[in-house]
Amino acid sequence: TQHGIRLPLRSGLGGAPLGLRLPRETDEEPEEPGRRGSFVEMVDNLRGKSGQGYYVEMTVGSPPQTLNILVDTGSSNFAVGAAPHPFLHRYYQRQLSSTYRDLRKGVYVPYTQGKWEGELGTDLVSIPHGPNVTVRANIAAITESDKFFINGSNWEGILGLAYAEIARPDDSLEPFFDSLVKQTHVPNLFSLQLCGAGFPLNQSEVLASVGGSMIIGGIDHSLYTGSLWYTPIRREWYYEVIIVRVEINGQDLKMDCKEYNYDKSIVDSGTTNLRLPKKVFEAAVKSIKAASSTEKFPDGFWLGEQLVCWQAGTTPWNIFPVISLYLMGEVTNQSFRITILPQQYLRPVEDVATSQDDCYKFAISQSSTGTVMGAVIMEGFYVVFDRARKRIGFAVSACHVHDEFRTAAVEGPFVTLDMEDCGYNIPQTDESTLMTGRA
């Protein structure tokens, strides 16, 4: 992982939605009983920020032990700290749980940088600000780790919400969400609204702030504006999707669309950045530089290393372009686009300059493992992981940060031919040596 971009190794304030609210549109899909409407008890159940991850409160064991757990759609293990660690305020104490069952099996998960390892077991798990159910789930009790937990992040474990195919040690270890759906009447769907603050939050502000919502089993109307647009889940391992076109300020990058998905494109709440394949990243940065050419920024800024500071309140958002990703639609030859603002891809960084400054890191970076639509993308949108119908929905988030001139957008339909050709078919040999790291 480079510069803490993949979380945990890869590297809003107040109760109201952050940023300016947008007017509601009325052209919504028909109601589906039990899956849409109001989920008041789950709204605002996430805290955190893009740089360190968004977490939900969970309880494990009997009597229940409360832990904060990172919500990660880019992995499939439920793993919690189970031994003292300098960065953990608390950890899962299996010996105190009367319902813990040891699976007598170890698990080792190496990342590009860092790792965690632990012991597998099962226990009773619930989500206080989630559905009113308790499930017996697989738990990896982390006994040793390196560069996994983040100092000051306030989470003690990770909830991998992707599919069994990428679970460790193998796909026989049932992920938490599969267990939840099997053991309860919760519909096979969840949705995420990640709310970037648009300004840096210190430790106490993060603890007091709302970071967003994870709606388990449904869709909450209050969390988005306009319509939901769906893209097929190409394959159930990661949440893999297909990007068919990329534009910077409306200018097509004009690359073979296979490049956008080389070797895959995934939606990953556990990654901070929008990560792009090398060729795509280089073309995108060139285009972003050209669009903002009245200014010159240091080379290290475009590498996500140096940060650029402006006097508080004077960040020239207007010189930075919008970025549009066109996703395969549900209908043949139809696509839709999601558009993010610099307010999403310039990530506020705290504790570096004076309080008179607003400082940012460039949150688009290079990838050798395909496109990763991380938190900076997800912070613009309400994202529905409709596992039941093998699709992912996007709508403009009610809490996304924007200005008076531009807003994030989800628009369609657009006619796009031969979209199936945009998908990259990973050779069988590569899949068997799947890289866990998201650097």
């Epitope: 009245t294 240091p298 080379d299 290290g300 290393e305 140096q306 570096v352």
Partner: antibody, heavy 120, light 108 residues
Framework: QLQLQESGPGLVKPSETLSLTCTVS??????????WGWIRQPPGKGLEWIGM???????WYNPSLKSRVTISVDTSKNQFSLKLSSVTAADTAVYYC????????????WGRGTLVTVSS | EIVLTQSPATLSLSPGERATLSCRAS??????LAWYQQKPGQAPRLLIY???NRATGIPARFSGSGSGTDFTLTISSLEPEDFAVYYC??????????FGGGTKVEIK
């Protein structure tokens, strides 16, 4: 070989405006790889960054001086200039112009400097 | 604001000796740090950039190391012309406006 040379009055009265010009020779100021900056050094003290400018006219200033500083560029003359208003004795210093290179992060080429004294 | 603290303030050495100058940042500046040399009556000159890269024309006896918060400028064997004041400067937070207070290397 690129050279920078500061010019301007060596004595300025308190409350007046200090004006300096940096002439770049041996290369074009319009080359997009660089910013052009001003740094000052009070007698016997350390270096203080004043601000910098890109050939497009985009400027960045030290917040502590921002209300009094204006940096401008004249690409036709291959020059950039500094104006510092409402000067006091605390503004007495050697003023250097410099090129900001190496990924526009470091001052890789400097003028010889000019001493400006603020006194009545 | 990132503060750069240089130590020692003065270093008294003889020609031929090894000089080790320190620059400590109040928080991490990654490897975005430069060293400058300033002789009396002259402008500063860039010696090292990005913590360890020698600028054009700088002799090999000058070397830089470190990352994060602790940086070192080493002059392996002092020549008479090396007695000067040395400044560090960070560029992690940009624009690059922070210099250290300087270390004077004087003849013992």
């Amino acid at each position: 070989q690129l050279q920078l040379q500061e010019s301007g009055p060596g004595l300025v009265k308190p409350s007046e405006t200090l004006s300096l010009t940096c002439t770049v020779s041996g290369g074009s100021i319009s080359r997009g790889s660089y910013y052009w900056g001003w740094i000052r050094q009070p007698p016997g003290k350390g270096l203080e960054w004043i601000g910098m400018i890109y050939y497009s006219g985009s400027t960045w200033y030290n917040p502590s001086l921002k209300s009094r500083v204006t940096i401008s560029v004249d690409t036709s003359k291959n020059q950039f200039s500094l104006k510092l208003s409402s000067v006091t004795a605390a503004d007495t210093a050697v003023y250097y112009c410099a090129r900001v290179g190496h990924g526009v992060s470091y001052f890789d080429l400097w003028g010889r400097g000019t001493l400006v004294t603020v006194s009545s | 604001e990132i503060v750069l603290t240089q130590s020692p303030a003065t270093l008294s050495l003889s020609p031929g000796e090894r000089a080790t100058l320190s620059c400590r940042a109040s928080q991490s500046v990654s490897s975005y740090l430069a060293w400058y040399q300033q002789k009396p009556g002259q402008a500063p000159r860039l010696l090292i950039y990005d913590a360890s890269n020698r600028a054009t024309g700088i002799p090999a006896r000058f070397s830089g190391s470190g990352s994060g918060t602790d940086f070192t400028l080493t002059i392996s064997s002092l020549e008479p012309e090396d007695f000067a004041v040395y400044y560090c400067q960070q560029a992690y937070v940009w624009p690059p406006r922070t210099f250290g207070g300087g270390t004077k290397v004087e003849i013992k």
